[in-house]
Interface confidence: medium
């Protein structure tokens, strides 16, 4: 899977969209999880309604919400009051039984609030190293990964 970068401003909301084939994933619940380390598990943050027919209802876990347009085939995740610690690699997943298919890999980057004059740098992202799979841009406030970037710092 390519990785799509979504950038948001600290303190504001960021909306992440994950398009999918609505026929292929018919009847399946969806989830948003956070990747723990480059080879680690993806830890569930929030999932859609237990009843698939009610997937359009927004579900919250803390400051993260999820809603699913099952007919149009778009999963939408909202990260409210974005903070630097929200930056990192995530996945949109389609659940079937005990299995989970990755719909999209997402790298969330947090930009400093331009009205916040603390000298904290203007961008936070998880790390740099020698290589990472190509990312493509789908949002106006998103970008491709630069050559040499990966979403995790190198392990010692």
């Amino acid at each position: 899977h390519n990785t799509t970068v979504f950038q948001g401003v600290a303190g504001q909301s960021l909306q992440v969209s994950c398009p999918y084939d609505s026929m292929k994933h018919w009847g399946r619940r969806k989830a948003w999880c956070r990747q723990l380390g480059e080879k680690g598990p993806c830890q569930r943050v929030v999932s859609t309604h237990n009843l698939w027919l009610l997937s359009f209802l927004r579900r919250w876990n803390g400051s993260t919400a999820i809603t699913d347009d099952t007919l149009g085939g778009t999963l939408t995740i909202t990260l409210r009051n974005l903070q630097p610690h929200d930056a990192g690699l995530y996945q949109c997943q389609s659940l079937h039984g005990s299995e989970a298919d990755t719909l999209r890999k997402v790298l969330v980057e947090v930009l400093a609030d331009p009205l916040d004059h603390r000298d904290a740098g203007d961008l936070w992202f998880p790390g740099e190293s020698e290589s990472f799979e190509d990312a493509h841009v789908e949002h106006s406030i998103s970008r491709s990964l630069l050559e040499g970037e990966i979403p995790f710092p190198p392990t010692s």
């Epitope: 009847g27 399946r28 698939w52 005990s98």
Partner: antibody, heavy 123, light 112 residues
Framework: QVQLVQSGAEVKKPGASVKVSCKAS????????MNWVRQAPGQGLEWMGR????????NYAQKFQGRVTMTRDTSTSTVYMELSSLRSEDTAVYYC????????????????WGQGTLVTVSS | DIVMTQTPLSLSVTPGQPASISCRSS???????????LHWYLQKPGQSPQLLIY???NRFSGVPDRFSGSGSGTDFTLKISRVEAEDVGVYYC?????????FGQGTKLEIK
């Protein structure tokens, strides 16, 4: 009406590979998972895996992982199942079977089956 | 993998009499979306399997109403209210809640 037509019987030697085809018609080929199920002589049904023709995504049963490859040709609405490193225990009838989709929720049941392809592995 | 266990393995029934086949799964078959993906197939002699019942109790199109399915969680039953000669064959329960999909060993129905 929905039809799944499979290729003819095959006789193979141990260690060889076999490729069975299943041509679909009468429905939106790209939008339904296709399964492969086999049945050894006098035995029950055994699920091998499935393919989604829309994008070629596959799930294989652990038992066949590394030996089975499922592919599709959307231009001819045909799916293929290739099994390598054949042994005598692979002698069986191989079926393709479409997954039924039923609202609300995907039913994941196999509603239409091919006529079966007998693969005999013998030295 | 989920193991499906059918009982009995064979059944001999007089035409017009009822028949019942039980299927038990090693784990709950309730999917994360709330549905239960337990199905019943019939394989008549010399034919490909055919779908009878899907998602526990839904009759597939063209299936006579003498066939009915019930159950929940891990225990399921297929009932034939009045067996007819054309019902002979091997009946399989199957789950598709989790990959890999699995089948019961089959129950052979014969006519007395």
């Amino acid at each position: 009406q929905v039809q799944l037509v499979q290729s003819g019987a095959e006789v193979k030697k141990p260690g060889a590979s076999v490729k069975v085809s299943c041509k679909a018609s009468g429905y939106a080929f790209s939008s339904s998972w296709m399964n492969w199920v086999r049945q050894a002589p006098g035995q029950g049904l055994e699920w091998m895996g499935r393919i989604y023709p829309g994008d070629g995504d596959t799930n294989y049963a652990q038992k066949f992982q590394g030996r089975v490859t499922m592919t599709r040709d959307t231009s001819t609405s045909t799916v293929y199942m290739e099994l390598s490193s054949l042994r005598s225990e692979d002698t069986a009838v191989y079926y393709c079977a479409r997954l039924l989709r039923n609202q609300p929720g995907e039913s994941y049941a196999m509603d239409y089956w091919g006529q079966g392809t007998l693969v005999t592995v013998s030295s | 993998d989920i193991v499906m266990t059918q009982t009995p393995l064979s059944l001999s029934v007089t035409p017009g009499q009822p028949a019942s086949i039980s299927c038990r799964s090693s784990q709950s078959l309730v999917h994360s979306n709330g549905y239960t993906y337990l199905h019943w197939y019939l394989q008549k002699p010399g034919q490909s399997p055919q779908l009878l019942i899907y998602k526990v109790s839904n009759r597939f199109s063209g299936v006579p109403d003498r066939f009915s399915g019930s159950g929940s969680g891990t225990d399921f039953t297929l009932k034939i209210s009045r067996v007819e000669a054309e019902d002979v064959g091997v009946y399989y329960c199957s789950q598709s809640t989790r990959v890999p999909y699995t089948f019961g060993q089959g129950t052979k129905l014969e006519i007395k």
